[in-house]
């Protein structure tokens, strides 16, 4: 069964800067990746970035840099100040779509006990949705 993992890290050098990394563990080609915060993409969350494997990347503040790391994983750097700044308990969600086969989404947040800049290796997060 395909799975999605999400890793959230706060940068030690800039405490208002977060890095979100997401990956898809499964076979099949990914047609779109959507990163959101405040909840899942289809349940009131706000889209931060969308990445298409061939047509490019779109992103919205406070997203600073979204990129593909591999064919099945992405990273997103967030940089905020004031109202648009993420906080330590913000939930980030990643949705990997493979049209028309289905989509898989998982969410994560900064580990409560982690120090800035330190993070455990990514582990598969529970699948919230599979069409």
């Amino acid at each position: 069964t395909p799975e999605v993992w999400v890793q959230v890290r706060m940068e030690a050098t800039e405490l208002s800067s977060f890095t979100i990394r997401c990956g898809f563990l499964g076979s099949g080609s990914i047609s779109l990746v959507t990163v959101s915060w405040g909840g899942p993409n289809g349940a009131g969350g706000t889209t931060l970035a969308v990445l298409h494997p061939e047509r490019g990347i779109r992103q919205w503040a406070p997203a600073r840099q979204a990129r593909w790391e591999t064919q099945s994983s992405i990273s997103l750097i967030l940089e905020g100040s004031g109202a648009s700044s993420p906080c330590a308990n913000t939930t980030f969600c990643c949705k990997f779509a493979s049209f028309p086969e289905g989509s898989w989404e998982a969410c994560g947040s900064l580990p409560p006990s982690s120090d800035p800049g330190l993070s455990a290796p990514p582990t598969p997060a529970p699948i919230l949705r599979a069409d």
């Epitope: 959101s36 993409n41 289809g42 349940a43 889209t47 047509r55 049209f99 989509s103």
Partner: nanobody
Framework: EVQLVESGGGLVQPGGSLRLSCAAS????????MGWFRQAPGKEHEGVAH???????RYVDSVKGRFTISQDHAKNSLYLQMNSLRAEDTAVYYC???????????????WGQGTMVTVSS
């Protein structure tokens, strides 16, 4: 959660017409296009038509002049009027909500289960 439910598919003779409907509910922030994709048996899927957030309809060349896409915002519905149908229009048609990456492409973020259109005599 976003829900898209298509209806209106079926068997039609060449030259005939069908109207597909898509009932939409739920919410995805920042999506800026809604449209129809299709996948013929054994073939790659293709975008048939979509409407931008500015209301401009766009069509793949093979359906221009034959298909018309429209929206009813009050009913949260999308439609595809298909006229002068041909055998090569046979496919599963999917209603999609997505993101624009260029003028002619709406990348699907959410889609329905699909409705089968068969054009045959």
């Amino acid at each position: 959660e976003v829900q898209l439910v298509e209806s209106g598919g079926g068997l039609v003779q060449p030259g005939g017409s069908l109207r597909l409907s898509c009932a939409a509910s739920g919410y995805t922030s920042r999506t800026d296009c809604m449209g129809w994709f299709r996948q013929a048996p054994g073939k790659e899927h293709e975008g048939v038509a979509h409407i931008d957030s500015d209301g401009i309809p766009r069509y793949v060349d093979s359906v221009k002049g034959r298909f018309t896409i429209s929206q009813d915002h009050a009913k949260n519905s999308l439609y595809l009027q298909m006229n002068s149908l041909r055998a090569e229009d046979t496919a599963v048609y999917y209603c999609v909500v997505g993101f624009k990456f260029d003028e002619d492409y709406c990348a699907p973020n959410d889609w329905g289960q699909g409705t089968m259109v068969t054009v045959s005599s």
